[in-house]
């Protein structure tokens, strides 16, 4: 049990103990959510105290202060998903419709996702907010008719399901046009039938 002497400058439990070179001893680290209020000596182990409100320490530590909690920064396109606690910093992510443009251990700056043009949709990603849109063409039988970062390709309308007939086929950028079977075709649509 700490404190105990260590000649080789290593401690038995690296996660929860640390080497104190002045006294050449191993002392306890403070658990998450606390900090060192009194350093250890040969006769007394580390004394820990709970982090004050709006501060935290995430790991077993021998810090003499707690880290200040920080808000997520909307200017940088970030939003909060979990508040700061004594054991964990504020958890942030990119606002919807944005992706992480700068990483420094965590996301520091989000930017607006690029629009995907008509006839395409954004390729689905494993994790939202991880990268900018990669636009892929609508697959056969589907269309998408807007410029948008989030619009999905939709299946073409099946005229027969509605008791209608096809007047114009769908494209990647437009839906099928349907008409009543009784409606006559416009002149440009009526083909000449050779007998």
């Amino acid at each position: 049990v700490p404190p105990y002497g260590s000649e080789n400058q290593t401690c038995r439990d690296q996660e929860k103990e640390y080497y104190e070179p002045r006294h050449r001893i191993c002392c306890s680290r403070c658990p998450p959510g606390t900090y060192v209020s009194a350093k250890c000596s040969r006769s007394r182990d580390t004394v820990c105290a709970t982090c004050a409100e709006n501060s935290y320490n995430e790991h077993w530590n021998y810090l003499t202060i707690c880290q200040l909690c920080r808000p997520c920064d909307p200017v940088m396109g970030l939003e909060e998903i979990a508040p700061c606690t004594s054991k964990r910093k504020t958890q942030c992510r990119c606002q919807p419709g944005m992706f992480c443009a700068a990483w420094a251990l965590e996301c520091t700056h989000c930017e607006l996702l690029s629009d995907c043009p008509p006839g395409t949709e954004a390729e689905l990603k494993d994790e939202v907010g991880k990268g900018n849109n990669h636009c892929v063409p609508c697959k056969a039988g589907h269309f998408q008719n807007t410029s948008s970062p989030s619009a999905r390709c939709q299946p073409h309308t099946r005229c027969e399901d509605q008791g209608l007939v096809e007047a114009a086929p769908g494209t990647a950028q437009s839906d099928t046009t349907c008409r009543n079977p009784s409606e006559s075709l416009p002149p440009e649509m009526s083909g000449t039938m050779l007998m």
């Epitope: 909307p74 504020t90 419709g97 607006l112």
Partner: antibody, heavy 120, light 106 residues
């Protein structure tokens, strides 16, 4: 209770600079971002920029990039904004407002504003 | 840049009236919207944040609603002390204020 203290008025000559202060009490500015907002006479509110007091990082709108310099002093819990190369259209009220952990995306607290008058 | 447009720019109403102020964004702001009240010679005061959450200490006659690009501040029964200018402010991809609606008493 969070309170923000700003000086009521500053007079500056064209071409010179003024430095506005915003002293915060009741909250450690190390936990916040301090924002600055301008309101020209009879006009609306316009966001100038913000500073992260722990590291001095600033973000400001393109319009104010070469006009406003934001700084902060953690020891006195005070934020500053220096306005340079003053012109007559810099005449306005300048407000400071923090976004805190409990209000990370809205301005629940405001200074009373400093009226800057630019006149020769 | 996302623009915020408020309408009407001026409004005159009587005590007890139900008043509706509008704020329109030039693109989807995902409900990231606040409302402020400002009286002459004073700093703005936060009324509503995140589209519809009433700030502590604000009377319940104030309410907010909306989504996408269209947002509304409603005063259910106008009181004399509500005469002020009202600003919306988005915090999606940065901060921008609307141009304001000046509300006067008839």
């Amino acid at each position: 209770e969070v309170q923000l203290q700003q000086y009521g008025a500053e007079l500056g000559k064209p071409g010179t600079s003024v430095k506005l202060s915003c002293k915060v009490s009741g909250y450690n500015i190390g936990n916040t971002y301090i924002h600055w907002v301008i309101q020209r006479p009879g006009k609306g509110l316009e966001w100038i920029g913000r500073i992260d007091p722990t590291n001095g990082n600033t973000i400001s709108t393109e319009k104010f990039k070469n006009k406003a310099t934001l700084t902060a002093d953690l020891s006195s819990n005070t934020a500053y904004m220096q306005l340079s190369q003053l012109k007559s259209d810099d005449t306005a009220i300048y407000f400071c407002a923090p976004t805190t952990l409990t209000t990370p995306d809205s301005f629940a607290y405001w200074g009373q504003g400093t009226l800057v008058t630019v006149s020769s | 840049d996302i623009q915020m447009t408020q309408s009407p720019s001026q409004l005159s109403a009587s005590v007890g009236d139900r008043v509706t102020l509008s704020c329109k964004a030039s693109q989807n702001i995902y409900k990231y919207l606040n409302w402020y009240q400002q009286k002459l010679g004073e700093a703005p005061r936060l009324l509503i944040y995140s589209t519809n959450i009433l700030q502590t200490g604000i009377p319940s006659r104030f309410s907010g609603s909306g989504s996408g690009t269209d947002y509304t501040l409603t005063i259910s029964s106008l009181q004399p002390e509500d005469a002020a200018t009202y600003f919306c402010q988005k915090y999606y991809s940065g901060f921008t204020f609307g141009s304001g609606t000046k509300l006067e008493m008839k």
